[in-house]
């Protein structure tokens, strides 16, 4: 009878370890909707705030080409900084090229000096693969050193002139990232 | 923006006791979260301990509790930071933070963001 009962139980605390399993799949889920979700409303507040705004770039944002780069003064986790972009209409910065990157580098160097800025990459859970927020892939030039052994997730960051690489819970600068407003004129 | 300026840092023995301090301005300081990160040569920032603008809730990192003690006082714009019972790993930069503007998620001091201060150095030998 004991055995009985005793299996029983383990039957239920298993039951329940499955249950747990599927509601953080299904939070993980739900949070990466919302995040898409916000991704573009981001780029359309971008969009539309053009009728409203002459200049390319909002106040105490940096112009590059087509692009408009805000430097951050606080520090947050990874997650957070990316909802902080989202605040702004924009996203954590995706280095297209080398050019891209020896911009924001020799800005940081100006600005800021040597520390740690969060970017929008981060390492795909599974197959380990490296993504930007949008869900390419970077240019083999631009792949994060192999610096971080952390067992969590983990996430780039840009310091001095290098792509690196650490867990997405410890708390860095960021660098956001939206599209430069065209001029009407 | 907000102004930090940390105090109280130095050299001392393990198992000795320092204070720290932090004296905010710039804007209500009685509106916002505090906190105290440090950060050790070649090693990750670390929360050590957190406070809620009330001062009813508070957090410490697990390598601290018991031995550190997060307070504030309003009416002085101050947070401090008693760490008792120091240990030579205890040894890092300490940096007095504000919570950002709109950051506040209620009790859950990971996810916000922080402004920060310069930082005071803080060296426990053995």
């Known amino acids: 009878k004991l055995l009985q009962v005793s299996t029983i139980a383990m039957q239920q605390q298993e039951k329940l370890i499955q249950q747990e399993r599927a509601l953080l799949n299904f939070t993980e889920w739900k949070r990466s909707c919302a995040l898409q979700m916000k991704y573009c409303q981001a780029f359309m507040q971008n969009s539309l705030s053009s009728a409203h705004n002459s200049s390319p770039c909002p106040n105490n944002w940096i112009q590059n080409r087509e692009s408009c780069y805000y430097v951050s003064e606080i520090w947050s986790i990874w997650h957070t900084s990316q909802e902080n972009c989202l605040k702004e209409g924009s996203t954590l910065l995706q280095i297209e090229s080398k050019e891209e990157m020896d911009f924001i580098t020799g800005s940081l160097r100006k600005i800021k000096g040597s520390y740690d800025y969060w970017v929008g990459l981060s390492q795909d859970g599974h197959s380990g693969r490296w993504l930007w927020q949008d869900g390419s892939s970077p240019s083999p030039g631009l792949l994060p050193a192999e610096r971080s052994q952390s067992a969590n997730q983990v996430c780039g960051y840009v310091k001095s002139n290098s792509l690196l690489s650490s867990n997405c819970s410890t708390w860095k600068y960021f660098i956001c990232e939206k599209y430069a407003l065209r001029s009407s004129v | 923006q907000v102004q930090l300026q940390e105090s109280g840092g130095g050299s001392v023995q393990a198992g000795g006791s320092l204070r720290l301090s932090c004296a905010a301005s710039?804007?209500?300081?009685?509106?916002?979260?505090m906190a105290w990160f440090r950060q050790a040569p070649g090693m990750e920032r670390e929360l050590v301990a957190a406070?809620?603008?009330?001062?009813?809730?508070?957090y410490y990192a697990d390598s601290v509790k018991g031995r550190f003690t997060i307070s504030r006082d309003n009416a002085e714009n101050t947070v401090y930071l008693q760490m008792n019972s120091l240990k030579p790993e205890d040894t890092a930069v300490y940096y007095c933070?504000?919570?950002?503007?709109?950051?506040?998620?209620?009790?859950?001091?990971?996810?916000?963001?922080?402004?920060q201060g310069q930082g005071t150095q803080v060296t426990v030998s053995s």
């Open positions: 710039g804007r209500t300081f009685s509106s916002y979260a």
């Open positions: 406070i809620s603008w009330s001062g009813g809730s508070t």
């Open positions: 933070a504000a919570e950002a503007e709109g950051s506040g998620r209620e009790g859950n001091f990971y996810e916000r963001s922080w402004y």
